[in-house]
Amino acid sequence: IWELKKDVYVVELDWYPDAPGEMVVLTCDTPEEDGITWTLDQSSEVLGSGKTLTIQVKEFGDAGQYTCHKGGEVLSHSLLLLHKKEDGIWSTDILKDQKEPKNKTFLRCEAKNYSGRFTCWWLTTISTDLTFSVKSSRGSSDPQGVTCGAATLSAERVRGDNKEYEYSVECQEDSACPAAEESLPIEVMVDAVHKLKYENYTSSFFIRDIIKPDPPKNLQLKPLKNSRQVEVSWEYPDTWSTPHSYFSLTFCVQVQGKSKREKKDRVFTDKTSATVICRKNASISVRAQDRYYSSSWSEWASVPCS
Amino acid sequence: RAVPGGSSPAWTQCQQLSQKLCTLAWSAHPLVGHMDLREEGDEETTNDVPHIQCGDGCDPQGLRDNSQFCLQRIHQGLIFYEKLLGSDIFTGEPSLLPDSPVGQLHASLLGLSQLLQPEGHHWETQQIPSLSPSQPWQRLLLRFKILRSLQAFVAVAARVFAHGAATLSP
């Protein structure tokens, strides 16, 4: 058993049929010694008396808020949560496996630049009685500070018969050094509590590996005289690291109709303009990627050919 | 060329060669994203490699103030990786695929280090650690980790030379 926060404790249980469970001793936070009784949750049934209560925790019915009283007055609470371990593996029932970029990916994180700011998100089908707490650091043995905000519900989607909820959190490295080569990864830890179930999820990454620039901005077209060709120009996204002579992007420019199966024109460039062939009912799209490190491409920025 | 006396390197040549290094480092090990090497005890095997750190003057302001600190750090790293790629980690079993770009990568590391430090001038170089894995599978894993680390190193070096070519070239 360990303390998650004040008056909230996590009991780690090997979860299998007829498991013996864990013996837990609760102590009432009071100077009183006599006349103390214990109850669980809203029940008035007295579970025991005395300053300590010994219980055998085997299942969720044994978890909950234990309260010690004296003469009708509440002295203190202890909330017990369960953390299940099945076949040596901690349960992952609360969050959905996003399976990208690999199986058992529960947390996904992205950064728009090298400033040390990043966003992580996760998915669940649970809508109520759900809380998250996020901590992060650079490195684990001698951790350096990363400050995370509160996790918030950022999107709801319908997937078949189920509703899916997306939560996200923003974090910022306290002393980021955008130009340096990272040697220690960022660690992100998410505590998830659903009713009386506790789970924790972790992710470890370098900022360079989660970079995904915003799409290029201010796409403009200029038809070339006596030609089917069009000069398309754009700018670096505002959120990208500066100076651009140091933090350079490379671009992919594509002309395509509405269907992916349609024919296309495609060219890669390090410049902020390119010449392509525009077709009726097609769109010109541009996306960006770090020029020197193959992290994710941005989403496309598009303008119609007409 | 960046000689210890402090004259400027051939920024544009260094830029071209460092960009080539980036391309080669990724073609030598393109599937890095599919293998989470940090799960394999990453810190004790590759924390000996020289990293370009915050105080090394490789940021745009540091380069403007005095690029020599940064160039020396990059030179150390290039020599270090060049030795690693020539060591039995890469030459031993399992043999590299005949079309592996590691040979080109090795030559390009040497080429860039020579651009930075001509014959007869010597910056101090970092000792190469004795990473001699006994098992072929350990060697394979170590190769992946070294190439992964090299990708990050040459990315920073390429940014330095691109910025230098754009803003510090005479």
Epitope: K263, R266, V267, R279 | -
Partner: antibody, heavy 118, light 107 residues
Framework: QVQLVQSGAEVEKPGASVKVSCKAS????????LHWVRQAPGQGLEWMGW????????EYAPKFQGGVTMTTDTSTSTAYMELRSLRSDDTAVYYC???????????WGQGTMVTVSS | EIVMTQSPATLSVSPGERATLSCRAS??????LHWYQQKPGQAPRLLIY???QSISGIPARFSGSGSGTEFTLTISSLQSEDFAVYYC?????????FGGGTKVEIK
């Protein structure tokens, strides 16, 4: 499968014109760009231009501007390349080539030998 | 127009050996570079597109690398059917242009 079949060899006199055909099969004709590339005997490849069979748009290499016309007939899935004012150095194998991507060539015809000789 | 230069013009290699073919552009073309193989009396065949992307059906012994102005086609272990002429082609800008070709012949 995607296939391009070209017309047979031609022998022309200097100053004449030649029209080479290229019949496409195995795909929807308007779904691919069509290019013409030529190769003089013992020489390398030279791009001449492209046509979009969907709308007839064309782009010619500057060298061939004014001397070449590329057309298509969607009813027969056939592309044509006409070269006018032939000279002896137009003697070459002329290839049609197609792709869904505009700037490189995925599928090639077998080539048509055009000999310009007096 | 962009001039593409291939070297060497002829490469003599023994079967089973590795062949490295070079292609240089007269200006930076990012990764807009494609490789073709042509055997005598036949049309060219696309091997690699956008510098390093492999084509299904093309043996894995063919690989491409490079960006900017310098590109390489590597044939890791030459088979008898690989003796041919190889062309690079840039697609950075029109007119599309080819290199002069490298003939890979039996040593």
């Amino acid at each position: 499968q995607v296939q391009l079949v070209q017309s047979g060899a031609e022998v022309e006199k200097p100053g004449a014109s030649v029209k080479v055909s290229c019949k496409a099969s195995g795909y929807t004709f308007t779904d691919y760009y069509l290019h013409w590339v030529r190769q003089a005997p013992g020489q390398g490849l030279e791009w001449m231009g492209w046509i979009d069979p969907e709308n007839g748009d064309t782009e010619y290499a500057p060298k061939f501007q004014g001397g070449v016309t590329m057309t298509t007939d969607t009813s027969t899935s056939t592309a044509y390349m006409e070269l006018r004012s032939l000279r002896s150095d137009d003697t070459a194998v002329y290839y049609c080539a197609a792709n869904k991507e505009l700037r490189y060539f995925d599928v090639w015809g077998q080539g048509t030998m055009v000999t310009v000789s007096s | 127009e962009i001039v593409m230069t291939q070297s060497p013009a002829t490469l003599s290699v023994s079967p089973g050996e590795r062949a490295t073919l070079s292609c240089r552009a007269s200006q930076s073309i990012s990764i807009n570079l494609h490789w073709y193989q042509q055997k005598p009396g036949q049309a060219p065949r696309l091997l690699i597109y956008f510098a390093s992307q492999s084509i299904s059906g093309i043996p894995a012994r063919f690989s491409g690398s490079g960006s900017g102005t310098e590109f390489t086609l590597t044939i890791s272990s030459l088979q008898s059917e690989d003796f041919a002429v190889y062309y690079c082609q840039q697609s950075n800008s029109f007119p599309l242009t080819f290199g002069g070709g490298t003939k890979v012949e039996i040593k």
